[in-house]
């Protein structure tokens, strides 16, 4: 082992370096001193450090560590924050378009039901937005609300047009009759199933992304313990006390120190890995009735089919309701069975197949691929931080916390440390309370994600069978399937090609006419490709 270089006889170098950390020189000895009061940089001989300097070094070391940690997580944090914002905005756009498609369907096919239908549709989609953002709304209640509100208007405007105003007090009876007589058939149940499944998954996806941000924010702003501060000081600054200004810590030594300092943080690793893999499973399952884009953008068709179902049974219904609500309505009924102009042109329900466009679905998969590159983020943190702070190459001629060594030996370093504080003890303390809390939250979201990520062979078609629809309505060979009445089915691939234009809005007044009902025109549409660059909250 080489003899230590002669200490700086005047502590001049140490003084000039320390002045950069702390203006004023009152704490720096002019010449080396015994340093008997030092607690971290325990001297083997005269030293250029004082107790006050040591305290300042500790503070600086902990600040450095926090900055290193923040820069280590910056890319990951940006990735999740950006995507959480993009997806939330994209989901809001889907809801807005779904509302406008539905309003356009009413305007084009049932003008007599507007503006009341617009009001009910608006309230329904407001509830959808609230639900996605985490409000405690029951989806079945939302759907029941929509049909409860629509039926009195359908009955009084379509089935019994010309009902006198005095008869409008039958609305309450009609609301009750709607459920009792199942006037919309199984369509409300079908919509409940589709909407609840797709929104549940969407909501949990957003919750998971927001928790990801919380995890990074928590570990980003960790305050390191005093013990850690002492270890970091010894690694980064104690060499200065001996006048060794240019010496770098040994790489192996840095790893040992970082593992000690980050023992609590590294405990997140297991749950973080599970989080990314569970999120991947969820995303892989977000298709068909588990894809809100697919479900919501096709709701207008299912609602249209449900109204057609009412109209097909108008004669029978009018008679039954006439008896049921007779006390509310003293008049002769005439059945308005299906006026010609109420038929929707079946051509408008055939939406063109769109291949290879980037959509929400591909955007989700892209996010997962990027997240997977960070799957070892927490276990790799100690190594990452050492590789991004000054350490000696190949562990030669480096600082081991006590002296300059030709070659770093972990065992020697550990023995040297034992007298001052126990590295093992530091590891055994367990994670900080905030880390424990975030681990609990990760466990919870992982549980939720696992619950939602059912096996690939989801019981989708079985569910539809139970609701009384033929299994042919939604076969596995179909790309996407919305609606239940064959004629009114829309097959749509990758609907959201317009999401790059986050401000794009299809007003009801600008809604396409019957010839291409509620289907965005290709030339109005730009791809979703640059969405990541549009609304970056960190720019």
């Amino acid at each position: 082992q080489p003899p230590p270089p002669p200490p700086d006889a005047t502590c001049h170098q140490v003084r000039s370096f320390f002045q950069r950390l702390q203006p004023g020189l009152k704490w720096v000895p002019e010449t080396p001193v015994p340093g008997s009061d030092l607690q971290v940089c325990l001297p083997k001989g005269p030293t250029c450090c004082s107790r006050k300097m040591e305290e300042k070094y500790q503070l600086t070391a902990r600040l450095n560590m926090e900055q290193l940690l923040q820069s280590a997580s910056m890319e990951l944090k940006f990735l999740i924050i950006q995507n959480a914002a993009v997806f939330q905005e994209a989901f809001e756009i889907v809801v807005r378009h779904a509302k406008n498609y539905t309003n356009a369907m009413f305007k084009n096919n049932y003008p007599s039901l507007t503006p009341q239908a617009f009001e009910f549709v608006g309230e329904f989609f407001t509830d959808v937005s609230l639900y996605i953002l985490g409000s405690d709304i029951n989806v079945d209640d939302m759907v029941n609300e929509l049909f409860d509100s629509l039926f009195p208007v359908i009955y009084t405007q379509l089935m019994n047009p010309g009902l006198p105003d005095s008869a409008l007090d039958i609305n309450e009876c009609l609301r009750g009759a709607r459920r009792d007589l199942k006037v919309f058939g199984n369509f409300p149940k079908l919509i409940m199933t589709q909407v609840s499944k797709s929104l549940q998954v969407t909501r949990i996806f957003l919750q998971a992304l927001n928790l990801g941000i919380e995890v990074i924010n928590t570990t980003d702003h960790l305050k390191f313990s005093k013990d850690c501060g002492r270890m970091l000081t010894r690694m980064w600054y104690c060499s200065y006390c001996q006048g060794l200004m240019m010496v770098k810590p040994c790489g192996g030594y840095c790893n040992v120190v970082m593992q000690g300092c980050m023992a609590g943080v590294v405990e997140i690793d297991k749950y973080w890995r599970e989080y990314i893999l569970s999120l991947e499973e969820l995303v892989n399952g977000m298709y068909r009735i588990y894809d809100m884009e697919n479900v919501l953008l096709g709701l207008f068709s299912t609602i249209h089919d449900s109204i057609q179902y009412v109209q097909k049974n108008a004669g029978k219904l009018t008679t039954t309701i006439g008896k049921l609500c007779a006390h509310s309505q003293q008049r002769q009924y005439r059945s308005a069975y299906y006026p010609e102009d109420l038929f929707i042109d079946k051509k408008v329900l055939k939406v063109a197949h769109v291949e290879h466009e980037e959509t929400l679905s591909s955007r989700r998969r892209e996010l997962i691929q990027k997240l997977k590159s960070f799957i070892s983020f927490y276990s790799a943190l100690p190594g990452y931080i050492c590789s991004h702070s000054p350490v000696a190459e190949n562990d030669t001629l480096c600082w081991n916390g006590q002296e300059l060594v030709e070659r770093y030996s972990q065992k020697a370093a550990r023995n040297g440390m034992k007298n001052q504080f126990n590295l093992h003890e530091l590891k055994m303390k367990g994670p900080e309370p905030v880390v424990s809390q975030i681990i609990d939250k990760l466990k919870h979201i992982n549980q939720l994600l696992r619950t939602m990520s059912m096996p690939k062979g989801r019981v989708l078609d079985k569910n539809l069978d139970e609701e009384g629809f033929e299994s042919g309505d939604c076969g596995d060979d179909e790309d996407e399937c919305i609606g239940g009445s064959g004629d009114g089915m829309i097959k749509v691939k990758n609907q959201l090609r317009f999401l790059a234009e986050l401000a794009y809005d299809l007003d009801v007044d600008d809604a396409p006419g019957n010839s291409q009902q509620a289907t965005p025109k290709d030339n109005e549409i730009s791809t979703f490709h640059n969405l990541g660059n549009v609304h970056s909250p960190l720019k």
Partner: antibody
Framework: QVQLQESGGGLVQPGRSLRLSCAAS????????MHWVRQAPGKGLEWVSA????????YYADSVKGRFTISRDNSKNTLYLQMNSLRAEDTAVYYC??????????????WGQGTLVTVSS | QSALTQPPSASGSPGQSVTISCTGT?????????VSWYQQYPGKAPKLLIY???NRPSGVPDRFSGSKSGTSASLAITGLQAEDGADYYC??????????FGGGTKVTVL
């Protein structure tokens, strides 16, 4: 004629319990969310609790959470508020109100006349 | 949950207009949520005047109108009449679907 009629109010000692009822008529009870709103003497309106039409979702103000329980019996067209661990600050006229909607709180289009609850020793 | 902010009082002469403001936060008035307005006479139950920010139930005179912008809503009464002297409350709900009322505004017809 849409009507709501509250009952069950009265004088009660602090720490005791009381159950309010609200009988509904003239509308399809199960289709609408229902609420309890209170008004302390000389003060403004304070929302207490709500329940969705199906009874599947319930909501409470922070001031009563854990002490009050809202419930409904759709077969009897009746809304209830079970009030436990009553405090002096719970003294108020309690109104039962019907929501315009079934899924959650929106606007209260029909109100009862209110029942006075006095909590005092 | 904290109450929405309303001015405690407002006044006007018959035939004049009065506007009552109601300020909330991004999680109640400013969100997707709707604002409603109620009129209450002393010793009586409140009556719904406006729902869904700007809709009037049948039977409410068109002198009453509501609007919402950002985190604020307002109720305008035009052509003030003696019977408009009452307390007025705004109401919305927060992101947890819990209802919030304003503190109330006493309107005096001079």
């Amino acid at each position: 004629q849409v009507q709501l009629q509250e009952s069950g109010g009265g004088l009660v000692q602090p720490g005791r319990s009381l159950r309010l009822s609200c009988a509904a008529s003239g509308f399809t009870f199960s289709s609408y969310a229902m609420h309890w709103v209170r008004q302390a003497p000389g003060k403004g309106l304070e929302w207490v609790s709500a329940i969705s039409g199906s009874g599947g979702s319930t909501y409470y103000a922070d001031s009563v959470k854990g002490r009050f329980t809202i419930s409904r019996d759709n077969s009897k067209n009746t809304l209830y508020l079970q009030m436990n661990s009553l405090r002096a600050e719970d003294t108020a006229v309690y109104y039962c109100a019907k929501d315009r909607r079934g899924s959650h709180a929106d606007a209260f289009d029909v109100w009862g006349q209110g029942t006075l609850v006095t909590v005092s020793s | 949950q904290s109450a929405l902010t309303q001015p405690p009082s407002a006044s006007g002469s018959p035939g004049q207009s009065v506007t009552i403001s109601c300020t909330g936060t991004s999680s109640d008035v400013g969100g997707y949520n709707y604002v409603s307005w109620y009129q209450q006479y002393p010793g009586k139950a409140p009556k719904l005047l406006i729902y869904g920010n700007s809709n009037r139930p049948s039977g409410v005179p068109d002198r009453f109108s509501g609007s919402k912008s950002g985190t604020s809503a307002s109720l305008a009464i035009t052509g003030l009449q003696a019977e408009d002297g009452a307390d007025y409350y705004c109401q919305s709900y927060d992101s947890s679907l819990r209802v919030v009322f304003g503190g109330g505004t006493k309107v005096t017809v001079l």
